[in-house]
């Protein structure tokens, strides 16, 4: 059985956080000054 938690965001488990970074495919690598 799955447990529910009281998180700081007070969100229920029915609303999933993907946990994923943006990882945009169009990001370009640029050396910092």
């Amino acid at each position: 059985s799955e447990t529910t938690t009281g998180t700081s965001s007070n969100s229920s488990q029915s609303t999933s956080n993907s946990g994923l970074a943006p990882n945009p495919t169009n990001a370009t690598t640029k050396a910092a000054g």
Epitope: E2, T5, N17, G19, N23
Partner: antibody
């Protein structure tokens, strides 16, 4: 309260496979977030190893990809790390952590793994 | 991979001092879709796991004292501790949570002067 706890052998021989498990309490690993492994060699910085998402999909650090497998046991609310062909360079404290869309918000306490014959 | 460079690598300071740690990324961490910077700060004490301090460059995590603040955008970021407390002596890491593989800075060790 979300808690993560690493477990596994503290000593692994060179060329063997390192196997660790992270047990999660207070949240179901199938309900959301990514569940990552991160390591820290003695006296050094942090290195992200990879994750298994709540969907079951995985992503690994290319620097380790050929040696890493992350899997899960949903019945036990656990996820695991296997790192093959280890060398002394794999000696580190290994952490499991929960990944949000912006950070690692919950971490295990870490487990030390030494690679030595 | 995005390279994260922190400076200084170590810093000696006294209780009550104002301290600033800098972090530079080799690529902009500003996501055009939501205008957020995906830069995170952690605090680590010896023998302990890192603790989340700040996400999105400037958003303090729950329970983090207001003396900790983050700023910056694009490639240049800072973590400021306005008035050092004894419990703040630790190592601080920045991390980019923007593009995989996720990467961390080398750390800044904050020591008592």
């Amino acid at each position: 309260q979300v808690q993560l706890q690493e477990s596994g052998p503290g000593l692994v021989k060179p060329s063997q496979t390192l196997s660790l498990t992270c047990t999660v309490t207070g949240y179901s690993i199938t309900s959301g977030y990514t569940w990552s492994w991160i390591r820290q060699p003695p006296g050094k910085g942090l290195e992200w190893i990879g994750y298994i998402q709540y969907t079951g999909s995985t992503r690994y650090n290319p620097s380790l990809k050929s040696r890493v497998t992350i899997s899960r046991d949903t019945s036990k609310n656990q996820f695991s790390l296997k790192l093959s062909s280890v060398t002394a360079a794999d000696t580190a404290v290994y952490y499991c952590a929960r990944g949000t869309t912006a950070s690692f918000d919950y971490w295990g306490q870490g487990t030390t793994v030494t690679v030595s014959s | 991979d995005i390279q994260m460079t922190q400076s200084p690598s170590s810093l000696s300071a006294s209780v009550g001092d104002r301290v600033t740690i800098t972090c530079r990324s080799s690529q902009s961490l500003l996501y055009s879709s939501d205008q957020k910077n995906y830069l995170t700060w952690y605090q680590q004490k010896p023998g302990k796991a890192p603790k989340l301090l700040i996400s999105w460059a400037s958003t303090r995590a729950s329970g983090v004292p207001s003396r900790f603040s983050g700023s910056g955008s694009g490639t240049d970021f800072t973590l400021t501790i306005s008035s050092l407390q004894p419990e703040d002596f630790a190592t601080y890491y920045c991390q980019q949570y923007f593009i995989y593989p996720l990467t961390f800075g080398g750390g800044t060790k904050l020591e008592i002067k």
